[in-house]
């Protein structure tokens, strides 16, 4: 009989991000003896699960096992066999499942139960599947980017995202855009966080952080589009919706039942004299922008200042990393460069939205039409959210850095989530030999 193989001097962790539109599996790796050092964990693999988000399996839970198979098998290939049983697996579900839970706690529990049973069938150290809160999503995204940028380290950072910035220990704010929610998280400058729900206190590597965070449910790009359609169809004279957020010549039939399926459109729901309507694109950035602004209620603020919908937002402070769909959309539109001013971004969006649909399809032949058709809306929405929603200005725009990866690791909440659950972010600054520690995020 063989003895149990000595583990490699590295460890692995798996986090599944069960988002509203899709699920991604991330594999992380780190040297076993440097668990408490900052910046040692890095991503070795991302596997995008084929299909929609897990909330869409509510009527077909028996298919969840098959849905997860390919990426879980990929994890088995990437991680050495001798490490499988020691590798923790976490699944965090975000706003798509939050919305399902709002509709039916029982259905959300059923989906999570099947997900748990499916994942526990693999030879990993499965640690559970849960719906993370919007506050957690914001906090873990903030931890991820600052960990990867070396902001928690007292030593000189080994990677600088901003060429002009060398060893600034000021943390970056985090801007995360998903399909169903969006998060804003940063350390305000000497500002009292007026609403306790938006305040987080961390002690990380011997330093205290007072962090502001808020997650806007229903303001992810997909749910924002549903909201906008539900709002606009209210005033349509017939079953034709002339929509400035889609390219001229674009046509798409929408079922009213699909439109009202999400809790995000409940406030706009009304009895319509038709069961379907047709979107007809007219491609006008300015009108699209105006329509989007109607989703943000800025008339009411019980605090010194608000973002929208009466949610407290302190004055913006420092640099921000904008990731997930902020990055994917702006990358597609070729607008991620540090050199592109806000005015230039707006100008390019005007041109892009005005391009005829047939022309767009030809120019981007390799892109799925469903995604391609929504870039005009998504780009306009990002501008509206950042400028009118979060109060960035033409001047402060240059403090937004659209980030996909930092040193090969995706920006997003998953790394921060794993660092926390594996107790790899000590409250105190570790000595050269890691201390035993008990206080974590």
């Amino acid at each position: 009989t063989q003895n149990k193989a000595l583990p490699e001097n590295v460890k692995y962790g798996i986090v599944l991000d069960a988002g509203s539109s899709h699920t991604s599996l991330y594999i992380y790796k780190w040297p076993a003896e440097k668990e408490n050092d900052t910046g040692v964990v890095h991503q070795v693999e991302e596997c995008r699960v084929k299909g929609p988000g897990i909330s869409k399996f509510v009527q077909k839970v028996n298919e969840i096992g098959i849905y997860l198979t390919d990426c879980m098998e990929r994890a088995r290939e990437v991680i050495p066999r001798s490490q499988h049983q020691e590798t923790p697996v976490y699944l965090g579900a975000t706003a798509g499942m939050r919305l399902l839970r709002m509709e039916s706690e029982e259905l959300a529990d059923r989906v999570l139960d099947v997900v748990e049973r499916s994942l526990s069938n693999y030879p990993f150290d499965f640690q559970g599947a849960r719906i993370i809160t919007g506050q957690e999503e914001g906090a873990y995204g903030w931890i991820t980017i600052n960990y990867l940028l070396g902001k928690f380290s007292q030593k000189t950072r080994w990677f600088s995202i901003v060429p002009y910035e060398t060893n600034n220990q000021e943390t970056f704010g985090a801007l995360d855009l998903g399909g169903a929610s969006t998060q804003v998280t940063f350390v305000p400058q000497n500002q009292t966080i007026e609403s306790p729900d938006n305040a987080l206190q961390f002690r990380l590597y011997g330093k205290d952080y007072n962090v502001y965070t808020h997650s806007f449910l229903c303001y992810g790009k997909d749910q924002a589009l549903w909201q906008k359609l539900a709002k606009d169809i209210q005033v349509a004279s017939n079953e034709i919706l002339r929509d400035p957020c889609f390219h001229p010549g674009y046509k798409k039939v929408v079922n009213v039942s699909d439109l009202y399926k999400t809790p995000c459109t409940k406030r706009f729901e009304m009895t319509l004299p038709f069961q379907q309507f047709e979107i007809q694109g007219i491609g006008n950035y300015q009108q699209c922008h105006q329509s989007i602004l109607e989703l943000f209620n800025t008339s009411y603020c019980p605090y010194s200042q608000c973002a929208f919908n009466g949610i407290f937002l302190p004055p913006l402070q420092g640099d921000f990393g904008a990731f997930s769909a902020f990055y994917f959309v702006m990358k597609f539109l070729n607008l991620t460069s540090e050199k592109v001013s806000q005015e230039k971004v707006t100008e390019m969006m005007k041109k892009f939205c005005a391009q005829p649909w047939e022309e767009i399809k030809t120019s981007y032949a390799g892109v799925k039409e469903k995604y391609l058709s929504e870039y005009c809306f998504s780009g306009t929405y990002i501008l509206s959210l950042l400028l009118q929603g979060y109060h960035f200005t033409a001047d402060s725009w240059e403090h937004i850095h659209f980030i996909g990866k930092i040193q090969g690791s995706d920006a997003g909440w998953t790394l921060g989530y794993m660092l926390n659950l594996t107790n790899m972010i000590p409250a105190e600054q570790p000595l050269s030999t890691p201390l035993s520690h008990s206080t974590y995020v």
Partner: antibody, heavy 121, light 107 residues
Framework: EVQLVESGGGLVKPGGSMRLSCAAS????????MNWVRQSPGKGLEWVAE??????????HYAESVKGRFTISRDDSKNTVYLQMNSLKTEDTAVYYC????????????WGQGTTVTVSS | EIVLTQSPATLSLSPGERATLSCRAS??????LHWYQQKPGQAPRLLIY???QSISGIPARFSGSGSGTDFTLTISSLEPEDFAVYYC?????????FGGGTKLEIK
């Protein structure tokens, strides 16, 4: 010496219950997944159940044929794994082996000598 | 569930001959296939793990090969003590399953 010793087998009527025990020695019991495998008279081998570690919340898995009737459990302080068998059927008659894998997973490099369970009226 | 089909059900050979036992999986299981030997009245004994990995203490005449769905256990030159029943086992996914066995008997 690495050893697994099963006990608790015997004769039981259909519908009855029985609890098998397996005492482990010679290795760090709490670090290894434990399994039960059975063999009906003159037949092949059939995996019955698996139990994982405390860190895995003692996760269990079962063959479809025993799900809902059999329960695997472990007591790490006693280095013992159990198989509680309820609603026994004649087709559960078999030699029950306690097994584990001391290297990697999902194969069995350590076996007990087996304990015979006979379900008959 | 992964179904393993072993062939032949019985193999009659003489000592000194080469034995080739086959195991086919109903779907790809990479190299997660293990081989056991069982003699009457005894518990099975692991011979080969992960399709081709040898076990210390098992004679070198036992070797395994294959990947995906088709696997082979080869005994290069049969010794009298090798006559027994051989089982393959799916170690890829739950439920763990065994093949029906190949009985290797003296001709």
């Amino acid at each position: 010496e690495v050893q697994l010793v099963e006990s608790g087998g015997g004769l039981v009527k259909p519908g009855g219950s029985m609890r098998l025990s397996c005492a482990a020695s010679g290795f760090t019991f709490s670090k290894y997944w434990m399994n039960w495998v059975r063999q009906s008279p003159g037949k092949g081998l059939e995996w019955v159940a698996e139990i994982r570690l405390k860190s895995n919340k003692y996760g269990t898995h079962y063959a479809e044929s025993v799900k809902g009737r059999f329960t695997i459990s472990r007591d790490d302080s006693k280095n013992t794994v159990y198989l509680q068998m309820n609603s026994l059927k004649t087709e559960d008659t078999a030699v029950y082996y306690c097994t584990t894998q001391l290297d990697l997973y999902w194969f069995f490099d350590v076996w007990g000598q087996g304990t015979t369970v006979t379900v008959s009226s | 569930e992964i179904v393993l089909t072993q062939s032949p059900a019985t193999l009659s050979l003489s000592p000194g001959e080469r034995a080739t036992l086959s195991c086919r999986a109903s779907q790809s299981i990479s190299d997660y296939l293990h081989w056991y030997q069982q003699k009457p009245g005894q518990a099975p004994r692991l011979l080969i793990y992960y399709a081709s990995q040898s076990i210390s203490g098992i004679p070198a005449r036992f070797s395994g090969s294959g990947s995906g769905t088709d696997f082979t256990l080869t005994i290069s030159s049969l010794e009298p003590e090798d006559f027994a029943v051989y089982y393959c086992q799916n170690g890829h996914s739950l439920p763990l399953t065994f093949g029906g066995g190949t009985k290797l008997e003296i001709k």
